[in-house]
Amino acid sequence: HNTTVFQGVAGQSLQVSCPYDSMKHWGRRKAWCRQLGEKGPCQRVVSTHNLWLLSFLRRWNGSTAITDDTLGGTLTITLRNLQPHDAGLYQCQSLHGSEADTLRKVLVEVLADPLDHRDAGDLWFPGESESFEDAHVEHSISRSLLEGEIPFPPTS
């Protein structure tokens, strides 16, 4: 899977969309999870309604909401009041029993609020790395990772 970058401004809302084949994933609930490390597990943040037919109802977990257009085949995640710690790699998933298929890998970038004059030093952007595979960009504001970019901040 390529990684799609979605950029949002700190303090504002960011909407992430994940298109999918509505028939291939018929009847399946969806989820939004956060990748813990480059090879670590994906920790569930929020999932759609327990009843698939009610997947269009928005479900919240803290400041993150999820809603699914099961006929159109678009999963939408809203990150409200975006904060620097929200930056990182996520996945949109389609759930089947104990299994989860990745619909899209998403890198969330948090940009400094241009009207906020506080220190933006804690805002994180991906660094350079020759090892990261190709990625695809789509604007929401969103883009794909450039070749060589890494989706995780360097560890000290």
Partner: antibody, heavy 122, light 108 residues
Framework: EVQLVQSGAEVKKPGESLKISCKGS????????IGWVRQMPGKGLEWMGI????????RYSPSFQGQVTISADKSISTAYLQWSSLKASDTAMYYC???????????????WGQGTTVTVSS | EIVMTQSPGTLSLSPGERATLSCRAS???????LAWYQQKPGQAPRLLIY???SRATGIPDRFSGSGSGTDFTLTISRLEPEDFAVYYC?????????FGGGTKVEIK
């Protein structure tokens, strides 16, 4: 009428290749998963793998991974099961089946082909 | 992989009697991802139950499924002559979507 029609019985020698088919009709072939199931003589059902003809996404049982290839040609609404080198132990009845569209994503196989008998003998 | 164990291997009953077939999974099957099939000699299997308890289209209401976790049951309330066949359970919780070994329901 929704149906899956499989190709006819095959008699082959060990080491030969084979490709059997499963043609769907009466429904949108590209939008349902198609599974393959083996039944050896006098034995039970064994799940081999599944394919989504819309994009050819395929999942195999570890027992059959590398032993067979599952494919599909959506332009002619047909799924395939093939072997590059048959063994006597491949002698069995092979069924294709459609996974229904159910709330919850259940893969209950609601439409079955009539089965293809494959006999491998020297 | 999840191993499905069916019992008994053979069930000898008379028409009109109640049949209770058991299927046990080696690991918990989430959200009741379990199906039941009927197979008669020389025929392809037929889907009876999906989601542990939902009857497939056209299946008579004498067939019912129940259970969760690792233990599932198929019940035929009153056996009809056409119900004597082999029954298989299958989990579709986790690939590979394994079948049980089958239970043969025969006429006593």
């Amino acid at each position: 009428e929704v149906q899956l029609v499989q190709s006819g019985a095959e008699v082959k020698k060990p080491g030969e290749s084979l490709k059997i088919s499963c043609k769907g009709s009466g429904y949108s072939f590209t939008t349902y998963w198609i599974g393959w199931v083996r039944q050896m003589p006098g034995k039970g059902l064994e799940w081999m793998g599944i394919i989504y003809p819309g994009d050819s996404d395929t999942r195999y049982s570890p027992s059959f991974q590398g032993q067979v290839t599952i494919s599909a040609d959506k332009s002619i609404s047909t799924a395939y099961l093939q072997w590059s080198s048959l063994k006597a132990s491949d002698t069995a009845m092979y069924y294709c089946a459609r996974a229904g569209h159910y709330d919850g994503g259940h893969l209950g196989m609601d439409v079955w082909g009539q089965g293809t008998t494959v006999t491998v003998s020297s | 992989e999840i191993v499905m164990t069916q019992s008994p291997g053979t069930l000898s009953l008379s028409p009109g009697e109640r049949a209770t077939l058991s299927c046990r999974a080696s690991q918990s099957v989430s959200s009741s991802y379990l199906a039941w099939y009927q197979q008669k000699p020389g025929q392809a299997p037929r889907l009876l139950i999906y989601g542990a308890s939902s009857r497939a289209t056209g299946i008579p209401d004498r067939f019912s499924g129940s259970g969760s976790g690792t233990d599932f049951t198929l019940t035929i309330s009153r056996l009809e002559p056409e119900d004597f066949a082999v029954y298989y359970c299958q989990q579709d919780d986790r690939s590979p979507y394994t079948f049980g070994g089958g239970t043969k329901v025969e006429i006593k």
